[in-house]
Interface confidence: medium
C-alpha cells in the first residue's frame, strides 16, 4: 500500500468517543447500471447556456480534483448564434459528499463533507423588478 | 441518536481484514459558506428547459431522500411561451457519493456508493443525422 507520513494526532480508530464515527468500506459500488454514467455528454457546448469547466484541486479531499461549471455568458445563445441579454445563463448547483482527511495526513480517518458544485448551466427568464 | 435494529451479521469494526475500510466522522461539515445552498431557486420553473422534481427515498442510504429532476418537455420553451421542438430539453446528470448501510440495518457500517442523479435540465441544439 501507500506510505503516508502519519500525523501523531491521528484519532484512535477504537476510541469510543470519536464522534459519530462509522466504518465505511471504500470499495465504491457503482449503482449506475441502467444508465451510462460516462456517456459522452457534449451538452456544455451545445446548450443555449453553454459552460466551461474549471479545475479546483485539494489534496486532502476525495475526489481531489473537482471541475466546476462556469457559464460562458450572462445571456443565452439565440437561434442566430448570438448572445441574447434578455435571457440569463445561470448555474445549476448541487451538493455533493466528499471525504476529507481529518486530521490531515491521517491515512484512514476521514470526515464526510458537503460541498456545493455547479454542474452545468440553464437558460432562464430574468426576474424584472419594476421601479414604481 | 437513532436506534437502528442491529443485524447480527454486522462486521466487526476492529476486523483488520474488513476490506478497504476507514473511520469516517459523520458530523458532516458544510463548506458552502459563501453561497446559500438552500436559497429558493426557482430555476426549474423559469428555465427554457423547465423540470419537475421527484422524490427518491431509501432508508438504507445517506442521504435518504434525493430529489431527481425530470425535464417537463422534449423541446424548449420559446419567447412566446410555447414548446419549440427544434430544440431539446435534456437532463444534466451528475454522479454523487452516498453511504449505504452494508450489511442492511447495521448502525455503523456503510459502503460508499456512486449513483447518477439528474440535477436539472438545459436546452441544447439537437444533433441532426443526415441520411445519405
Amino acid at each position: 500500500g501507500i506510505t503516508i507520513p502519519r500525523n501523531p494526532g491521528c484519532p484512535n480508530s477504537e476510541d469510543k468517543n470519536f464522534p459519530r464515527t462509522v466504518m465505511v468500506n471504500l470499495n465504491i459500488h457503482n449503482r449506475n447500471t441502467n444508465t451510462n454514467p460516462k456517456r459522452s455528454s457534449d451538452y456544455y457546448n451545445r446548450s443555449t447556456s453553454p459552460w466551461n469547466l474549471h479545475r479546483n484541486e485539494d489534496p486532502e479531499r476525495y475526489p481531489s480534483v473537482i471541475w466546476e461549471a462556469k457559464c460562458r455568458h450572462l445571456g443565452c445563445i439565440n437561434a442566430d448564434g448570438n448572445v441574447d441579454y434578455h435571457m440569463n445563463s445561470v448555474p445549476i448547483q448541487q451538493e455533493i459528499l466528499v471525504l476529507r482527511r481529518e486530521p490531515p495526513h491521517c491515512p484512514n480517518s476521514f470526515r464526510l463533507e458537503k460541498i456545493l458544485v455547479s454542474v452545468g448551466c440553464t437558460c432562464v427568464t430574468p426576474i424584472v423588478h419594476h421601479v414604481a | 441518536g437513532i436506534t437502528i435494529p442491529r443485524n447480527p451479521g454486522c462486521p466487526n469494526s476492529e476486523d483488520k481484514n474488513f476490506p478497504r475500510t476507514v473511520m469516517v466522522n459523520l458530523n458532516i461539515h458544510n463548506r458552502n459558506t459563501n453561497t446559500n445552498p438552500k436559497r429558493s431557486s426557482d430555476y426549474y420553473n423559469r428555465s427554457t428547459s423547465p423540470w419537475n422534481l421527484h422524490r427518491n427515498e431509501d432508508p438504507e442510504r445517506y442521504p435518504s431522500v434525493i430529489w431527481e429532476a425530470k425535464c417537463r418537455h422534449l423541446g424548449c420553451i420559446n419567447a412566446d411561451g410555447n414548446v419549440d421542438y427544434h430544440m431539446n430539453s435534456v437532463p444534466i446528470q451528475q454522479e454523487i457519493l452516498v453511504l449505504r448501510r452494508e450489511p442492511p440495518h447495521c448502525p455503523n457500517s456503510f459502503r460508499l456508493e456512486k449513483i447518477l442523479v439528474s440535477v436539472g435540465c438545459t436546452c441544447v441544439t439537437p444533433i441532426v443525422h443526415h441520411v445519405a
Epitope: G1, I2, I4, L26, I28, N36, P37, K38, R39, S40, S41, D42, Y44, L53, E57, P59, E60, Y62, P63, S64, V65, I66, W67, I96, P107, N108, V117, V119, G120 | R20, V22, I92, Q93, Q94, E95, L97, K114, V119
Partner: antibody
C-alpha cells in the same frame, strides 16, 4: 504538468524478482493514482494493476495476482512495481501511468491513463 | 474479462485522407472507452477519454464517438506525424483491457 520518470533497464534471470520505480513530479501525488502497464516485444498493452494514492488501495489483474506488488511512498512521490518469479514471458517494456482522481463534467473520472512514464525495458534470460 | 477487438489491424493511408478505426467491446461498457496513440519507441499518449472527449493538447483532427459496445476513432485529414499504433482501452470493469492495436502508416 506531471512528469513520470522510471528507473533504468534491467536484465534478470528466470526465478528472480524485479522492482521498477516511477518518480512523479510536477503535481500533487495524492491527487492521482498510478497504474502499471506492460508491453511485450511487438505486442499490445497489458494492464497489470494500480494504486489509488489517496487511499492506498491497490487493484491487480488476476493474471498477476500473488506475483505483483504495487506500492507508493508519498514522501518521495514514488510508486513501485515488484514482480516475482520471473520467466522469459515477462520480457517487456514496463510503463507507469498516471490515473486522475477527478470529479469531471459531473462524473468521478478515475480510470484512464493521462500521462505515461518513459518505460523500463526488462529482459529475462538465463 | 472484457475483450476489445479493433479493426482493421493495419491501415496504409495517404496524407489528407480520413482514417476510421473501430473498437468493439465483448459487452456493454457505456462510454468508458479511451483511445491512445503510440509512436515507434515512444510511450502511449492519451487522445480521447470517455469515448468522445479530447485530451488536452490533442489536435482537432482526432475525434471519437460511440457508446455501449461500438466505438470509433476518426482522424480527419491524416498528417505524416500521425503514423502510429492506436489502442482502445476500457475502464468499465477490472481488469482494464486494451484492444490489440491498429497500425496506421503513411503511403
Amino acid at each position: 504538468e506531471v512528469q513520470l520518470v522510471q528507473s533504468g533497464a534491467e536484465v534478470k534471470k528466470p526465478g528472480e524478482s524485479l522492482k521498477v520505480s516511477c518518480k512523479a513530479s510536477g503535481g500533487r501525488f495524492r491527487t492521482y493514482g498510478i497504474s502499471w502497464v506492460r508491453q511485450a516485444p511487438g505486442q499490445g498493452l497489458e494492464w497489470m494493476g494500480g494504486i489509488t494514492n489517496f487511499f492506498g488501495w491497490t487493484d491487480y489483474a488476476q493474471k498477476f495476482q500473488g506475483r505483483v506488488t504495487i506500492t507508493a511512498d508519498e514522501s518521495t512521490t514514488t510508486a513501485y512495481m515488484e514482480l516475482s518469479g520471473l520467466t522469459s514471458d515477462d520480457t517487456a517494456v514496463y510503463y507507469c501511468a498516471r490515473v486522475p482522481n477527478e470529479f469531471w463534467n459531473g462524473y468521478y473520472a478515475t480510470d484512464y491513463f493521462d500521462n505515461w512514464g518513459q518505460g523500463t525495458t526488462v529482459t529475462v534470460s538465463s | 474479462e472484457i475483450v476489445l477487438t479493433q479493426s482493421p489491424d493495419f491501415q496504409s493511408v495517404t496524407p489528407k485522407e480520413k482514417v476510421t478505426i473501430t473498437c468493439r467491446a465483448s459487452q456493454e461498457i457505456g462510454a468508458s472507452l479511451h483511445w491512445y496513440q503510440q509512436k515507434p519507441d515512444q510511450s502511449p499518449k492519451l487522445l480521447i477519454k470517455y469515448a468522445s472527449h479530447s485530451a488536452s493538447g490533442v489536435p482537432s483532427r482526432f475525434s471519437g464517438s460511440g457508446s455501449g459496445t461500438d466505438f470509433t476513432l476518426t482522424i480527419n485529414s491524416l498528417e505524416a506525424e500521425d503514423a502510429a499504433t492506436y489502442y482502445c482501452h476500457q475502464s468499465d470493469g477490472l481488469p482494464y483491457t486494451f484492444g490489440q492495436g491498429t497500425k496506421v502508416d503513411i503511403k
